[in-house]
Every structure is written in structure tokens, then in C-alpha cells.
């Protein structure tokens, strides 16, 4: 239903990485505009992205208020230049999004190896603790702050001179691994939330190798 010159939005899709969260939809508007509303299951609707011709809406500011809540959004379609117009049922045409729980569903962004330091036959590899847009007491929380021990990292490492790989896990942002003296190693890390059933793993970090800028060596 709805007015003859508006179509309902469709393919409503949440795109979320490290809690930066955007709702996308189709179609590209022709003689119509959109407004988005978001709410928690028990909360009131809040309007965002008023009368926009975009087909996306950044809802980060809303979902970071409580990342463990489940959110629902809806996209209203209005005729361009006549936003007061309503559908045949007396209200604007709209479409609901799938439910979205940020804590369980936001994608884990590609991690970055911050540094590695060799001391004898040990190497300490540190993963950058990425800042999110989740706030507490007016400060932005890191990924570790938000997920705590639910977040682990997997390290892959190998001698530059061979293809044989090893792996290690940590529930902090640091690895301490044994290496052969005099050998250069390469490293890549991956973020994992083992308790999840979807979006469990990030993509691998860029590979960092000893003998390059980020490292430090001490006898």
C-alpha cells in the first residue's frame, strides 16, 4: 500500500564493524525521500536521517548507548516535496529491518600489530587495542574494554625462511612466544570471539616481519 508515487524500502541491511553501524537499504530514491527510526525492543522510536535521499543512515550514536541491547530500525518513504503525505492506511509507507544486537553481531575489524620486541629467544608481540565509538564516562572504550575476556587473539607466525607456521592464542593483547635465535619471523594476528556463532573472526592483520620498522631487538 502507500501513495502511488512512493515505494517501500527493501533489502534493509546492517553494516557494522567495531560498533560503527550503518543501516543500508534500497532502492535509490526517485521522487521520494527517507527517514529512519530506531528503537530497542522495549524503547521508544527515535528518528534519524530525516528526509534523506541517501540509502544509508549512520546509527552508531544510538547503538553505542547500550551495545548489548537488541535494536530494530525502520525506513519510512515519503514523496519528495510532500513529506506530510501518508499511505492509504493513513500513515507513511515503511519497512522494518532485521533485529540487530551489536555485541553479538558487529564485525571485528582487521587488527593491527602494534609492535614486536625480541629479547633473546623470546618475542613479545603486541596487538593494537583499537578504539571504538562506545563511550563510558565520556571516554571512548577500546575493543578490549568492551569485550573483555570474550575477545581473544590468534597469532600466526613463521620463519621468514620457511613455510611452516605456528600459532598461539591470548586473552590479552600480548603474545610471548619462543623463537630460534638468529632467525627472522613474520607475524599475523586475527581477532576472535569464541562465544559467538556468527561473525566470530576478523580478517587477518597485515603481515609484519622482523627486520622491518615495527620491531625492536635486544640481546
Amino acid at each position: 500500500s502507500g501513495t502511488t508515487n512512493t515505494v517501500a524500502a527493501y533489502n534493509l541491511t546492517w553494516k557494522s564493524t567495531n560498533f560503527k553501524t550503518i543501516l543500508e537499504w534500497e532502492p535509490k530514491p526517485v521522487n521520494q525521500v527517507y527517514t529512519v527510526q530506531i528503537s530497542t525492543k522495549s524503547g521508544d522510536w527515535k528518528s534519524k536521517c530525516f528526509y534523506t535521499t541517501d540509502t544509508e543512515c549512520d546509527l552508531t550514536d544510538e547503538i553505542v548507548k547500550d551495545v548489548k541491547q537488541t535494536y530494530l530500525a525502520r525506513v519510512f518513504s515519503y514523496p519528495a516535496g510532500n513529506v506530510e503525505s501518508t499511505g492509504s492506511a493513513g500513515e507513511p509507507l515503511y519497512e522494518n529491518s532485521p533485529e540487530f544486537t551489536p555485541y553479538l553481531e558487529t564485525n571485528l575489524g582487521q587488527p593491527t600489530i602494534q609492535s614486536f620486541e625480541q629479547v633473546g629467544t623470546k618475542v613479545n608481540v603486541t596487538v593494537e587495542d583499537e578504539r571504538t565509538l562506545v563511550r563510558r564516562n565520556n571516554t571512548f572504550l577500546s575493543l578490549r574494554d568492551v569485550f573483555g575476556k570474550d575477545l581473544i587473539y590468534t597469532l600466526y607466525y613463521w620463519k621468514s625462511s620457511s613455510s611452516g607456521k605456528k600459532t598461539a592464542k591470548t586473552n590479552t593483547n600480548e603474545f610471548l612466544i619462543d623463537v630460534d635465535k638468529g632467525e627472522n619471523y613474520c607475524f599475523s594476528v586475527q581477532a576472535v570471539i569464541p562465544s559467538r556463532t556468527v561473525n566470530r573472526k576478523s580478517t587477518d592483520s597485515p603481515v609484519e616481519c622482523m627486520g622491518q620498522e615495527k620491531g625492536e631487538f635486544r640481546e
Epitope: T154, K166, T167, N171, P194, V198, R200, K201
Partner: antibody, heavy 117, light 107 residues
């Protein structure tokens, strides 16, 4: 529900190779790590190696390095283990297992490989 | 490589007994320790993950404790179906290593 279905028992000659498979259902293998574990008759469990199907990283126990290759075909949700230069002590049950990051939470039913001339 | 020392290698117990099995790692494994039950001719079954968390469908008489290098599996009140072999596994670092196993037999 989650299932790991392994290929059937194999009889192989010493010096040859064997390739066994593990077909996963009920989950996306790219979201997990997949491993192979060996158990000789009457003995304990021994980790052979593992694979991350999302990025094709494979890791092996040094005892098996050079003789074992673990691969994954994400299009068919199947993990493979190929073991070469077979000897009598490779006679064992081989299990595939899913690694959640916290544990090997699901296991296949096991594939018996018998190496005999 | 990390060595896992599991003890005892076998024990005899009666239904209703409290049973404790320990695993000691040769270095800190940061709680990447899991416990498995295996019955004859069957695949291992996950009991405890991340040192202390109970796997789905596992009775609450099973519990795990420990951190660092020392870990324990406890069966608070042994049931007839608990007679089996138990293994610990460290998966904090490759090569992953299992304990030698503990066979729990009927006294």
C-alpha cells in the same frame, strides 16, 4: 545441528599416501579452526595439526611436519588430511575436530587407517 | 613445546565418589585448557572449555578450575556413565598437546 562426517576406513601399504576427509554441516567452517587428532590402538590422543579455512593457514606438529598436509575446501565445507610415507605406526583412528577458540567442541566419528603390507 | 602432565593415569572409584583429575602445563597456558571424556570405540566428547566453562549438555557434576599452569577436572558425584577415560588439552600454543589421559574405573 553441528556434524562432522569423516570418510570410511582405509587399508594402505607402507610407503604410500592416504587422504581422508571430514565434511562439516550445521556451521560455516570459515568461522572456526579445524584440526586432526591421531589415536593409536589403546593409546592416548595426539594432535597432528590444524587449519584455518578462512585464510588457509595450516599448522602441524613437528613430528608430522613434511608428511602431513591439511587443507579445506570451503565450497563443500570439507577438510582433508593427507598423510604420506605411511608406516606401521600410522595405523590409528584419525579424528577431525572443530576448534571454537575455546575448545575442540565437536568431533568426527573417526576414520580407521590400517597400514599393512 | 608445552608439556601436559596429567595425573593420575588411572583411578578406581565408586558411584557417588568425588573424583579429581589434574593437569600441569610446563608453562602458562592462559586458561586455554579443555577437558574431554572418551568411552571405548567412541570419539572424545567436550566437557569443559576455557578451563572452567561447562560445555553444552554436560551435567553440572562436572566442573573445571585452575589458571596459569595448574588445572583440575572434578566430578562431584561419580555416576555409572562417567566411567571412561579423561584427557586435558592445551590449545594456547602449537603444537597443541594432550595430557596422557586418566582412566576412571569401577572400584
Amino acid at each position: 545441528q553441528v556434524q562432522l562426517l569423516e570418510s570410511g576406513a582405509v587399508l594402505a601399504r607402507p610407503g604410500t599416501s592416504v587422504k581422508i576427509s571430514c565434511k562439516a554441516s550445521g556451521f560455516n567452517i570459515k568461522d572456526y579452526y579445524m584440526h586432526w587428532v591421531k589415536q593409536r590402538p589403546g593409546q592416548g590422543l595426539e594432535w597432528i595439526g590444524g587449519n584455518d579455512p578462512a585464510n588457509h593457514h595450516s599448522m602441524y606438529d613437528p613430528k608430522f611436519q613434511g608428511r602431513v598436509t591439511i587443507t579445506a575446501d570451503t565450497s563443500t565445507s570439507t577438510v582433508f588430511m593427507e598423510l604420506s610415507s605411511l608406516r606401521s605406526e600410522d595405523t590409528a583412528v584419525y579424528y577431525c575436530a572443530r576448534d571454537s577458540g575455546y575448545a575442540m567442541d565437536y568431533w568426527g566419528q573417526g576414520t580407521l587407517v590400517t597400514v599393512s603390507s | 613445546d608445552i608439556q601436559m602432565t596429567q595425573s593420575p593415569s588411572s583411578l578406581s572409584a565408586s558411584v557417588g565418589d568425588r573424583v579429581t583429575i589434574t593437569c600441569k602445563a610446563s608453562q602458562d597456558i592462559k586458561s586455554f585448557l579443555s577437558w574431554y571424556q572418551q568411552k571405548p570405540e567412541k570419539a572424545p566428547k567436550s566437557l569443559i572449555y576455557y578451563a572452567t566453562s561447562l560445555a553444552d549438555g554436560v551435567p553440572s557434576r562436572f566442573s573445571g578450575s585452575g589458571s596459569g599452569t595448574d588445572y583440575t577436572l572434578t566430578i562431584s558425584s561419580l555416576q555409572p556413565e562417567d566411567f571412561a577415560t579423561y584427557y586435558c588439552l592445551q590449545h594456547g600454543e602449537s603444537p597443541y598437546t594432550f595430557g596422557g589421559g586418566t582412566k576412571v574405573e569401577i572400584k
